[in-house]
C-alpha cells in the first residue's frame, strides 16, 4: 500500500522559519502534490502550495519556496512573519496524486517540545483516500 510521510522542521538559525518535508512511498508516477495547512485538502485545510513534476511549482504566503527534493519527495519553506509562532501548533498535510494509485494524503505537525533544528519523526497520520 502506498504511504505518504510528513516531517515538519524548525530551522535552527531562524526560529521564524519552518520547512515541511513530504514524501511518497509506493509505485506509480506522481502527477501532482498539494500542501495544505489547518487540515487535509477539502476538509478545512488551506492550500499553500501545488507542485507538478513538469509544469512547475506554485506557493502562496506564508510559504516561501516549494521544491522537489527527489522524484518522490518535496519540501516547502515557510516564513512566519508574526511575533508569535502559529506554525508550532499547525497541522500540515501533503496530498500526492499518483497514477494509477489515486490520491494519498498524510498530515504532520511540529512536536510541542521541538528544539530548533529537530524535525518531527516521520510518523504520518494517514488519510488513506484513494480518490
Amino acid at each position: 500500500t502506498p504511504e505518504v510521510w510528513v516531517q515538519v522542521q524548525m530551522e535552527a538559525t531562524e526560529l521564524s522559519s519552518f520547512t515541511v518535508h513530504c514524501g511518497f512511498l509506493g509505485p506509480g508516477s506522481i502527477s501532482l502534490v498539494t500542501v495544505s495547512w489547518g487540515g487535509p485538502d477539502g476538509a478545512g485545510g488551506t492550500k499553500l502550495a501545488v507542485l507538478h513534476p513538469e509544469l512547475g511549482t506554485r506557493q502562496w504566503a506564508p510559504a516561501r519556496q516549494a521544491r522537489w527534493e527527489t522524484q518522490s519527495s518535496i519540501s516547502l519553506a515557510l516564513e512566519d512573519s508574526g511575533a508569535s509562532s502559529p506554525f508550532a501548533n499547525t497541522t500540515f498535510c501533503c496530498k500526492f496524486a499518483s497514477f494509477p494509485e489515486g490520491s494519498w494524503e498524510s498530515c504532520g505537525s511540529l512536536p510541542p517540545s521541538s528544539d530548533p533544528g529537530l524535525s518531527a519523526p516521520p510518523t504520518p497520520v494517514p488519510i488513506l483516500r484513494a480518490d
Epitope: 501545488v50 513534476p53 509544469l55 512547475g56 504566503a61 521544491r67 522537489w68 527534493e69
Partner: antibody
C-alpha cells in the same frame, strides 16, 4: 471541459480604473487558481500575477505591483483583475490562464484613450 | 528575473519542411531534485490566446501532434516541427516555468511560403 470566459472589451480614459473578469467552469471550485497575463499589441507575453482561490493569496510580478489587484468570488467561480491609474501603456489584451497555463481565456482588450 | 531569448524572430518555410527554433534562458531551468526542466512552449495563432504545446521541455500536451518535439536542458532549448503544415502558421513562445516571475521569450513568428 475546462472553460475560462472573460469579460468584453473596455475603452477607458487615462487615470481611470477598470475591472475585468474571468469566469471558470469545468473543474473543482478550490482548483480555480488563476494567472493573469498581459500582451501589448505586437509584443510578447508578460505574467502579471496569480491568485489562490483557497485563501485569496496572491503573487505578483514586481512590475505590476501597485498597478494590478487580483480578487476572487468563490460563489460565482470568478476571478477579477483591477487595473488602476491607467495610461496608454496599459492598452493591451489581458488573458486569464489556469494555474500551469494549460487553459486560457479568450482575452479582454483594454484600450486607454482620451 | 530570468530572461528568455528566442531566435530567430521570424522564419518562412514551405509546407513539409522541418523547422527548428531556439530558446535560451539566462539561468538554468533544471530542477536538480527531480531532474526536470521547467520550460514550456506555446503556440499562438492570429486572434487567439496562446495554447500550451510542450511542458517540462519535452512533454507534449495532450492532443498536440507528434510533429512537435521539444528538447534541451539547463539553459538551451529547442522546438522542432518535423514537417510543417499550413495550420502551424503562428507565433511560438517559450516560457520560464521555473521561478517567478514566469517570463516569456520574445517569440518566433512562423510563416508559410
Amino acid at each position: 471541459e475546462v472553460q475560462l470566459q472573460q469579460s468584453g472589451p473596455e475603452l477607458v480614459k487615462p487615470g481611470a480604473s477598470v475591472k475585468i473578469s474571468c469566469k471558470a467552469s469545468g473543474y473543482t471550485l478550490t482548483d480555480y487558481y488563476m494567472n493573469w497575463v498581459k500582451q501589448s499589441h505586437g509584443k510578447s507575453l508578460e505574467w502579471i500575477g496569480d491568485i489562490n482561490p483557497n485563501n485569496g493569496g496572491t503573487n505578483f510580478n514586481q512590475k505590476f505591483k501597485g498597478k494590478a489587484t487580483l480578487t476572487i468570488d468563490k460563489s460565482s467561480s470568478t476571478t477579477y483583475m483591477e487595473l488602476r491609474s491607467l495610461t496608454s501603456e496599459d492598452s493591451a489584451v489581458y488573458y486569464c490562464a489556469s494555474l500551469f497555463f494549460d487553459y486560457w481565456g479568450q482575452g479582454t482588450t483594454l484600450t486607454v484613450s482620451s | 528575473d530570468i530572461v528568455m531569448t528566442q531566435s530567430p524572430s521570424s522564419l518562412s518555410v514551405s509546407a513539409g519542411e522541418k523547422v527548428t527554433m531556439s530558446c535560451k534562458s539566462s539561468q538554468s531551468l533544471l530542477n536538480s531534485g527531480n531532474q526536470k526542466n521547467y520550460l514550456a512552449w506555446y503556440q499562438q495563432k492570429p486572434g487567439q490566446p496562446p495554447k500550451l504545446l510542450i511542458y517540462g521541455a519535452s512533454t507534449r500536451e495532450s492532443g498536440v501532434p507528434d510533429r512537435f518535439t521539444g528538447s534541451g536542458s539547463g539553459t538551451d532549448f529547442t522546438l522542432t516541427i518535423s514537417s510543417v503544415q499550413a495550420e502551424d502558421l503562428a507565433l511560438y513562445y517559450c516560457q520560464n516555468a521555473h521561478s517567478s516571475p514566469y517570463t516569456f521569450g520574445g517569440g518566433t513568428k512562423l510563416e508559410i511560403k
